[in-house]
C-alpha cells in the first residue's frame, strides 16, 4: 500500500510541478519593473521569455513579441531551451508514469516492467525539475547582473537605445512559480524513484522449485508470477508467492495441499 501511495503521490506532485513549469514558461512576468527608489512612472513594464509588455496607467496593456532570434542574447535562448527541455521531459515522464502506476492494470504487464517505467519517469521528472530550476536561476542571475545597468534594458543589442535611468527590472512572479514548480517536479521524481524500489521484485539466493499441480501444470517461482494457462480464474496474473515482503493491496494466496503431488 505504501508503495502505491508513494508512486501515486509522486505522480500527482510531478503533474502539479510540470503544470507549473508550463505556466511559468508562458508567463509574461519573468522580470518586472522595479518600483522601489525609482521615479514614479505612468507605465509598468514587464517581460517574459517570449514578449515584453507595458501596462499604462489607464489600464491599457500592450505586448510585443520578440520577433527575432539572432537579436536576442544567448542567455535568454538558453533559458528558453532549458524550460522547453524541462516541459518535454516532464510530459514524456508523465506519459510513462501513467502506465507505470500500480493502480492501473494494462494487459499482462509485469511488476518488474512497471518498476522500470517508474524509475524512468522518476529520472525524467528529476531532470525536468532540474532544467526548470536551472532555467529560472540563469534568468534570475541575468537580472541581478543587469540590475544596476544605467541603460535599464535587459536585452541589449536590440536597437539604438536612448540613455535612460527610468527602468530597472527585478524578479517577476514567473521566477517564483518556476522555482516552486521545478522543486515539486524534482520531489515528485524522487518519490517515483523511491516507489520503484518497492515495486521491483526482490532477488532470492535459492533456486526456483517447480511444483506440479494435479489439475494442470502450474509452476511456482520465488519472486515470480503464477504461470497462467489461460483458463479459470488465474488470468489476472496475481502474485502468489514472492519469497519476501508483500504490499497490503496484493491478494494473498497460498498453495493448498491439493497442489502437491
Amino acid at each position: 500500500m505504501a508503495v502505491t501511495a508513494c508512486q501515486g503521490l509522486g505522480f500527482v506532485v510531478s503533474l502539479i510541478g510540470i503544470a507549473g513549469i508550463i505556466a511559468a514558461t508562458c508567463m509574461d512576468q519573468w522580470s518586472t519593473q522595479d518600483l522601489y527608489n525609482n521615479p514614479v512612472t505612468a507605465v509598468f513594464n514587464y517581460q517574459g521569455l517570449w514578449r515584453s509588455c507595458v501596462r499604462e496607467s489607464s489600464g491599457f496593456t500592450e505586448c510585443r513579441g520578440y520577433f527575432t532570434l539572432l537579436g536576442l542574447p544567448a542567455m535568454l535562448q538558453a533559458v528558453r531551451a532549458l524550460m522547453i527541455v524541462g516541459i518535454v521531459l516532464g510530459a514524456i515522464g508523465l506519459l510513462v508514469s501513467i502506465f507505470a502506476l500500480k493502480c492501473i492494470r494494462i494487459g499482462s504487464m509485469e511488476d518488474s516492467a512497471k518498476a522500470n517505467m517508474t524509475l524512468t519517469s522518476g529520472i525524467m521528472f528529476i531532470v525536468s525539475g532540474l532544467c526548470a530550476i536551472a532555467g529560472v536561476s540563469v534568468f534570475a542571475n541575468m537580472l541581478v547582473t543587469n540590475f544596476w545597468m544605467s541603460t535599464a534594458n535587459m536585452y541589449t543589442g536590440m536597437g539604438g537605445m536612448v540613455q535612460t535611468v527610468q527602468t530597472r527590472y527585478t524578479f517577476g512572479a514567473a521566477l517564483f512559480v518556476g522555482w516552486v514548480a521545478g522543486g515539486l517536479t524534482l520531489i515528485g521524481g524522487v518519490m517515483m524513484c523511491i516507489a520503484c524500489r518497492g515495486l521491483a521484485p526482490e532477488e532470492t539466493n535459492y533456486k526456483a522449485v517447480s511444483y506440479h499441480a494435479s489439475g494442470h501444470s502450474v509452476a511456482y517461482k520465488p519472486g515470480g508470477f503464477k504461470a497462467s494457462t489461460g483458463f479459470g480464474s488465474n488470468t489476472k496474473n496475481k502474485k502468489i508467492y514472492d519469497g519476501g515482503a508483500r504490499t497490503e493491496d496484493e491478494v494473498q494466496s497460498y498453495p493448498s495441499k491439493h497442489d502437491y503431488v
Epitope: V40, T41, S57, S58
Partner: antibody, heavy 120, light 113 residues
Amino acid sequence: EVQLVESGGGLVQPGGSLRLSCAASGFTFSSFGMHWVRQAPGKGLEWVSYISSGSSPIYYVDKLKGRFTISRDNAKNSLYLQMNSLRAEDTAVYYCARAGYAVRNALDYWGQGTLVTVSS
Amino acid sequence: EIVMTQSPPTLSLSPGERVTLSCKSSQSLLNVGNQKNYLAWYQQKPGQAPRLLIYGASTRESGIPARFSGSGSGTDFTLTISSLQPEDFAVYYCQNDLFYPLTFGGGTKVEIK
C-alpha cells in the same frame, strides 16, 4: 458623446475649503482613470492629481499633497477634488480630464472648467 | 519632477505658413519597455478647454486634421503644422506622460502676424 461637467467653484477666503465635482457621461466612467488640471489666469496648464479607475493608485503634484484630496464615486459617475487650506495661488480654472485608453496616458477629453477664486 | 521647456514662447505667423514648435524634456520620455515616447501635444483656444492633438509623440488623435504632425524621440520633440489655418491660432502645450507628476510645458502662443 463624452461629456465632463465641473461644478463647485466660486469665491473662497484664504484658509477656506472647497469641494469640486465633475459629472461624467457618455462613457463607462468606472473603466477610466481621471485627472484634475488647473490653469491660473493668464498662465499655463498645471497638472494637479490623478485617480485610477479603481481609486488606487492616486497621484498628486508634490506641492499640493496634504491639502488636496482626489476621490471618485463610480456609482454616481462623479469625480471630486477636496481643497483645504486654500491660498491665493490656488486661484485658477480647474479642469477635470479623462485618462484616455490606448493614447499613451494622454488626457483625451476635458471639461470646460470651473473657476476657483481665493481672495479675502 | 520632469521639466518641460517649450520654445519659442510666442510665434507671429500668417495663414498658410509652416509652423514648427519645439519641446524639450529634462529626462528621456522614451519608455524602453515598448520603445514608445510618452509625450502629448494639446491645443487651447481662449476661453476653451485644451484639446488633445498628438499622443505618443507622433500619433494624431482621431478627428485631428492631417496638417498637424508630431515627431521626435527621447528628450527633443516637435509639433509641425504644415499649413497654418485661421482656426489654428491658439496656445500649444506639450506634456510629459511618462513620469508623475505629468508636467506641462509653458506653452507656445501662435498668433496672427
